[in-house]
Interface confidence: low
């Protein structure tokens, strides 16, 4: 065991701690009557060098002095920073079988003298906190280095604390454990840090500060807010602060926001009125404090107060639209639709809508409340009707929005011209049009309305619509637009008391249909054949069908088939053809065409016309 050193001793010159670049002499001496045998000349002392417990060198060749069989001196150079272990062993040269025996060992530390500590910074957290200082120690010394922090001030105030750095811990901060009170606000204090190790010492420049320079107030606590008269836009923020605070900084934002509203408040005394809050909005509030208007440091931000502002009555106008459907000769069904207010207009949870239908001349009024965004009533077809809707939350109702019920497509002179629908990308369609040519009253606005052309869509799904100012002739529709679906798009031109409309079909993306129409029957009437079919199922259309094609050819013929192309109309499911020869058997089939191409053929049917051909 090298720590016990029963066999001998190891010494280092000039010292076991040396500066980087220096050499050292290590002497290994055997104690009297210790050795391999009675022949001292057979004793051989060797020196082994270990770094991190790993043998890195046998210093046999570095012997500078040798008392045969008693002591040896070795010179070591180029030692790296940190600690190196040297172990002296006794090798008995006349006995090759026995391993060398440890005699003793020594650790040599290589390092540097400490640099003067720099960038001293002191803080006292809160009026009741204690002074703590930190500094930059400079280069690592690789040696145990002691640091002393000394503070001096008025009335012979002195105080000091110590700590040390080594390879396991770093000392660059000390808490002096003393409290500076506000009555010393004008006094000056001096701190100095001294560093010392086995290779030298150094001292920082003196660092001078006042109470206000170093005291960082504690962040405000117990933050709360009172909303004046349950107002959603005005509230008084209250908090607790340390007694000496003269300046506060407030920051607040809606929870989903990315930028803070900032406010500076002087002598707020834990209270500040906010007047620009948004009703019914989740907010986050934080406060910071400072002890002096010009000097000193801001506290950390307080913990957040998160709360929602109260509701206020809705503002803004509802976007209303409607559909009219004649039921019989004297009754019509009116379906009113409206869009939900956005949060900044709703200013609370909308509880219900107040809906009114009024006949202008007879003063008949139908009223109801609903929680839905649509309402349907049957009313007489006679008279001029107007509708109004308002939204209500717990604080009140919005001003009613009025709309005149007119025959939406009743006036041909108001129908927009040259309506087109172009696919822009996967989820929107650009609709363009020209104004009515000979409108006898001014267009007040355009409404672009669209719905998917799928079975039952009129009854199952409310329409989607956009209001367009009268000087605009285009709309990009995107709400609920999906690729490979055909939409019926109507452009309405509305005047004060009339409406005109034009219709077009459009899709945002298309493919050729999956299948062709299914021929269900072929009948002969008055020398013409009538082909009847069922439409392609909605999911298989994959866009707007532009036309159908009916193909026919004589059975067993290898000639190209003839074809007839029919403009697609949803309501049409039969078509006549008249160019077939009687008593010739034909094969007929159909395909469907979208802007992307033609479908595979549908089912084949054979037919042999009997009558006289044209």
């Amino acid at each position: 065991n090298i720590d016990v050193c029963k066999l001998g001793t190891v010494t280092v010159q000039p010292a076991p701690v040396i500066p980087l670049g220096s050499a050292a002499n290590i002497s290994c001496s055997l104690n009297p009557k210790q050795g391999c045998s009675h022949y001292p000349s057979s004793n051989e002392l060797i020196l082994l060098k270990f770094v991190n417990d790993v043998l890195v060198e046998n210093l046999h060749g570095k012997k500078v002095h040798d008392h045969t069989g008693h002591s040896s001196t070795f010179q070591v150079t180029n030692l790296s920073l940190g600690m190196t272990l040297f172990v002296c062993k006794l090798n008995c040269s006349n006995s090759q079988k026995k391993p060398p025996v440890p005699v003793c060992g020594v650790e040599i530390s290589v390092g540097v003298a400490p640099e003067p500590p720099q960038n001293i910074s002191c803080v006292q957290e809160g009026e009741n906190g204690t002074v703590a200082c930190s500094w930059n120690s400079g280069k690592v010394t690789y040696l145990k280095t002691n640091y002393t922090l000394q503070l001096s001030g008025p009335n012979n105030l002195t105080c000091q604390k110590q700590c040390f750095s080594d390879n396991r811990q770093n000392c660059n901060r000390l808490d002096l454990g003393i409290n500076l009170s506000p009555d010393l606000a004008e006094s000056r204090f001096i701190v100095r840090v001294t560093a010392i190790n086995d290779l030298g010492n150094s001292s920082s420049l003196p660092h001078t500060f006042t109470f206000l320079d170093i005291v960082i107030p504690l962040p405000p606590w117990d933050i709360r807010i009172n909303f004046l008269n349950a107002s959603g836009s005005r509230g008084t923020l209250q908090w607790e602060d340390e007694g000496q605070v003269v300046l506060n900084q407030l920051r607040y934002q809606p929870l989903n926001s990315t930028s803070w509203n900032m406010v500076n408040a002087t002598n707020a005394k834990g209270k500040y009125d906010l007047r620009d809050l948004r009703p019914f909005t989740e907010y986050e509030f934080q406060i910071s404090s400072k002890l002096h208007l010009s000097g000193g440091s801001w506290s950390n931000w307080s913990e957040s107060l998160r709360t929602r502002t109260p509701e206020e009555e809705p503002v803004g106008i509802l976007d209303i639209w409607y559909m009219k459907q004649d039921i019989d000769y004297d009754r019509q069904q009116i379906s009113l639709f409206w869009k939900s207010l956005n949060p900044s207009e709703a200013r609370g949870k909308i509880l219900h809508y107040q809906v009114t239908l009024q006949e202008v001349t007879k003063k008949t009024t139908l009223q109801n409340t609903t929680r839905h965004t649509s309402w349907t009533r049957v009313i007489p077809r006679t008279g001029a009707w107007t509708a109004s809707v308002s939204a209500a939350n717990s604080k009140g109702a919005s001003a009613p929005t009025h709309i005149n019920i007119v025959d939406l497509c009743g006036t041909g002179l108001l129908a927009p011209h040259q309506v087109s629908a172009k696919s822009e990308n996967m989820d929107n369609i650009l609709v363009t049009w020209q104004p009515p040519k000979k409108a006898d009253s001014a267009v007040r606005e355009y409404i672009v309305e669209w719905r998917a052309l799928q079975p039952g869509s009129i009854t199952k799904f409310p329409p989607h619509w956009l209001r367009i100012p009268p000087d605009n002739m285009s709309a990009l529709i995107s709400e609920n637009i999906k690729p490979y679906i055909c939409y019926e798009i109507r452009v309405h031109a509305l005047s004060e008391s009339q409406g005109g409309c034009s219709s077009i079909r459009g899709d945002s993306k298309h493919k050729a249909p999956v299948s062709g129409p299914h021929i269900t029957a072929i009948t002969e009437k008055k020398e013409r054949l009538f082909i009847s079919w069922t439409h392609i199922p909605f999911p298989e259309q994959r866009g707007c069908i532009l036309h159908y094609r009916i193909y026919w050819k004589e059975r067993d013929s290898t000639a190209q088939p003839e074809l007839c192309e029919i403009q697609y109309r949803r309501s049409q499911n039969s078509h006549p053809i008249s160019s077939l020869q009687p008593r010739v058997t034909y094969v007929l089939w159909m395909t469907a065409v979208t802007a992307a191409g033609e479908s595979p053929q549908g089912n084949e049917r054979e037919f042999c016309p009997q009558g006289k051909a044209n």
Partner: nanobody, 119 residues
Framework: QVQLQESGGGLVQAGGSLRLSCAPS????????MAWFRQAPGKEREVVAT????????YYADSVKGRFTISRDNAKNTAYLQMNSLRPDDTAVYYC????????????WGQGTQVTVSS
């Protein structure tokens, strides 16, 4: 709506320990300030301990200071009350409560869990 469910109550000898848990559901737990109250037979309900939404600030009634510890684990959506050195006068129904911010009245309450300390 927030539902609070306490657990961990029971019978314990004086000097023993219990740990109560409270698991809210129905709202983001990390935005709720939490508290434990208790009500002994024939007495008014009293606050035992409170903890802010971030866990950075706590409060204890004088009668439990140094013996009880309130904590929260926002990752597990749970608030805890560690009760050590229990005394017979700690016997009560313990209620978990929550509020939507670090101020104001407690809006949400649990059903309560019985803690009985025998001598």
């Amino acid at each position: 709506q927030v539902q609070l469910q306490e657990s961990g109550g029971g019978l314990v000898q004086a000097g023993g320990s219990l740990r109560l848990s409270c698991a809210p559901s129905g709202r983001t737990f990390s935005t709720l300030a939490m508290a434990w109250f208790r009500q002994a037979p024939g007495k008014e309900r009293e606050v035992v301990a409170t903890i802010s939404w971030s866990g950075g600030r706590t409060y204890y009634a004088d009668s439990v200071k140094g013996r009880f510890t309130i904590s929260r684990d926002n990752a597990k959506n749970t608030a805890y009350l560690q009760m050590n050195s229990l005394r017979p006068d700690d016997t009560a129904v313990y209620y978990c409560a929550a509020r939507g911010s670090d101020y104001g009245s407690y809006d949400y309450w649990g059903q309560g869990t019985q803690v009985t300390v025998s001598s």
